[in-house]
């Protein structure tokens, strides 16, 4: 499958359309604080450079990989040392470690801008002016603000904002139509950046094993009525597509993806039964619909797991001979049975039964000692099960703002060193999963809360490795990919935390909080909430309470009243002395 | 600086009653929130009650329903009325308001 020129076969199989995204979206997800306009220049150059290499593979330079002529580039930027600091030096390094440089640098938290919506008229107007250009800094918006956003997904949400400005910006009442399908653009698109963004750490940060592992438990659970070899070969050509996007080689990863859509479409009928409507549709819809596809029906007459993997003289046999493709197939065959388990669960059950093996094989009557092994299962099993079952009662008690209040204030207490900002942003997140997943009948409440709490959890392991503050957030984080949960919610209140000196400042409040949205006054209520128990870390539910009570109320009389910045300087010293008082402080 | 001033401390048998009074100088308590903490030999303060700036009253889970708190405007005074008083409720119990804490007032409770 060796070209002469990579880039001209990358460019033929994309189109050019594809290909220049492709690359707006690989340099801005490197170059995050680039303007859009030097971007642009950029890949028209490196398009116009590909174009040659089409018409004469061997012109000069065609045969260099991509991240030779990406890398190079890149490093014609000016503003580079100044901009970016120290990735500058990336530019003094040969292939592959300059391109390993510039993924080491790629920022979860950018310092850039607030993305505003302007009014519905000047982006319909922008739109219609030019098309194309407002399109791409859609792409660039997004991408230099994701740098691991799945970057043919990516494709796939500028394919649906493309259609809703050409539909809604025709329409009688544009914003109507508009805004609504902005909104679920924008969730979508944060959804699924994150959920990216914990198959690129589990590739980086625990290593293809720990993704394929994911990757058999997740299929197996998809496509319960394919083969184990059907699923294997997946398994592999998924892995392949995620380490290319992870790893910055875009192209490729587009290419390869498109190519599993096609083998899976092609291979429908030892696959899944519920595929065809995926298949028929486009290239970008088709893989986004495969990625997405519920789960098949289980085959009715599947045997019981133990005659294999616990009653069979051979376990310790079959084990010895291939230990990875064994456990694959428990994982596989476990993974099947039970759509109703989260894929950590069912990774945390396929460790342990590893870890029996390896000790039972080496004893003096193996079977003797993993006979049992089932029977570990259920405390493992049980563990989340019970706390979903918790908390979905207190989110039906509380309702979603009031619950992720209570999150707040519970992952303040285990991690205070965290940045406000981050535990507001995680907290409000984990507090989602209520109106996500606890509307979901027994069977699927499991797979819905926990395996998004994963990705919620790794937003703040990402956010936090960027400025390690709390050894406790680094022991949950590196630990083990599939006990993050588990070792956050185990965590106590830190005993060891010096509470913050008491600041008035950080609860001075203005009148511009009375234009700002309910959600952003949410998160104004959720940032003093965090600070009340930075400096108060053993106050108790009832004077947070009685605080917020009394910061609501202020805000209400202070936005109602006829002069608001002196209601809020007067009233403001009295709010702060009556939560000193509350608190105790 | 505003003056607060606790009083009705003492010691009272368990089951028996007390009302404790925190005089606050040079501010009013209406419209400004106040609390009441106490702190048990060798233990850390704890919460106790708190009148919110819109009269709201939170107490502890502790003394929910045997602790009553009240307010007396011609006098600016602030009242904390314990019944059903338990040996645990053995502590000095401090008025504060105003960014301003009283220097407690003793409160024992004998078996």
């Known amino acids: 499958d060796a070209h002469k020129s990579e880039v001209a076969h990358r460019f033929k199989d994309l189109g050019e359309e594809n290909f220049k995204a492709l690359v707006l979206i690989a340099f801005a997800q490197y170059l995050q604080q680039c303007p859009f306009e030097d971007h642009v220049k950029l890949v028209n150059e490196v398009t116009e450079f590909a174009k040659t290499c089409v018409a004469d593979e061997s012109a000069e330079n065609c045969d260099k990989s991509l991240h030779t002529l990406f890398g190079d580039k890149l490093c014609t930027v000016a503003t580079l040392r100044e901009t970016y600091g120290e990735m500058a030096d990336c530019c003094a390094k040969q292939e592959p470690e300059r391109n390993e440089c510039f993924l080491q640098h790629k920022d979860d938290n950018p310092n850039l801008p607030r993305l505003v919506r302007p009014e519905v008229d000047v982006m319909c107007t922008a739109f219609h002016d030019n098309e194309e250009t407002f399109l791409k800094k859609y792409l660039y918006e997004i991408a230099r603000r994701h740098p691991y956003f799945y970057a043919p997904e990516l494709l796939f949400f500028a394919k649906r904002y493309k259609a809703a400005f050409t539909e809604c910006c025709q329409a009688a009442d544009k914003a109507a139509c508009l805004l609504p399908k902005l909104d679920e653009l924008r969730d979508e698109g944060k959804a699924s950046s994150a959920k990216q963004r914990l198959k690129c750490a589990s590739l980086q940060k625990f290593g293809e094993r720990a993704f394929k592992a994911w990757a058999v438990a997740r299929l197996s659970q998809r496509f319960p009525k394919a083969e184990f070899a059907e699923v294997s070969k997946l398994v592999t050509d998924l892995t392949k597509v995620h380490t290319e996007c992870c790893h910055g080689d875009l192209l490729e990863c587009a290419d390869d993806r498109a190519d599993l859509a096609k083998y899976i479409c092609e291979n429908q009928d030892s696959i899944s039964s519920k595929l065809k409507e995926c298949c028929e549709k486009p290239l970008l819809e088709k893989s986004h619909c495969i990625a997405e596809v519920e789960n098949d029906e289980m085959p009715a007459d599947l045997p019981s797991l133990a005659a294999d993997f616990v009653e069979s003289k051979d376990v310790c046999k079959n084990y010895a001979e291939a230990k990875d493709v064994f456990l694959g197939m428990f994982l596989y065959e476990y993974a099947r049975r039970h759509p109703d388990y989260s894929v950590v669960l069912l990774l945390r059950l396929a460790k342990t039964y590893e870890t029996t093996l390896e000790k039972c094989c080496a004893a003096a009557d193996p079977h003797e000692c993993y006979a049992k092994v089932f029977d570990e299962f259920k405390p493992l099993v049980e563990e989340p099960q019970n706390l979903i079952k918790q908390n979905c009662e207190l989110f039906e008690q509380l309702g979603e703002y009031k619950f992720q209040n209570a999150l707040l204030v519970r992952y303040t207490k285990k991690v205070p060193q965290v940045s406000t900002p981050t535990l507001v942003e995680v907290s409000r997140n984990l507090g989602k999963v209520g109106s996500k997943c606890c509307k979901h009948p027994e069977a699927k409440r499991m797979p819905c809360a926990e395996d998004y709490l994963s990705v919620v959890l790794n937003q703040l392991c990402v956010l936090h490795e960027k400025t390690p503050v709390s050894d406790r957030v680094t022991k949950c984080c590196t630990e083990s990919l599939v006990n993050r949960r588990p070792c956050f919610s185990a965590l106590e209140v830190d005993e060891t935390y010096v509470p913050k000196e008491f600041n008035a400042e950080t609860f001075t409040f203005h009148a511009d909080i009375c234009t700002l949205s309910e959600k952003e006054r949410q998160i104004k209520k959720q940032t003093a909430l965090v600070e009340l128990v930075k400096h108060k870390p053993k106050a108790t539910k009832e004077q947070l309470k009685a605080v917020m009570d009394d910061f609501a109320a202020f805000v209400e009389k202070c936005c109602k009243a006829d002069d608001k910045e002196t209601c809020f300087a007067e009233e403001g010293k009295k709010l702060v002395a009556a939560s000193q008082a509350a608190l105790g402080l | 600086q505003v003056q607060l001033v606790e009083s009705g401390g003492g010691l009272v048998q368990a089951g028996g009653t007390l009302r404790l009074s925190c005089t606050a100088s040079g501010s009013t308590f209406r419209g400004n929130g106040m609390a009441w903490h106490r702190q048990a030999p060798g233990k850390e303060r704890e919460f106790v009650a708190y009148m919110g700036m819109t009269d709201r009253i939170t107490y502890a889970e502790s003394v929910k329903g045997r602790f009553t708190l009240s307010r007396d405007d011609a006098k600016n005074r602030v009242y904390l009325h314990m019944n059903n008083l338990e040996v645990e409720d053995t502590a000095v119990y401090y008025c504060?308001?105003?960014?301003?804490w009283g220097q407690g007032t003793q409160v024992t409770v004998s078996s």
């Open positions: 504060t308001a105003f960014g301003s």
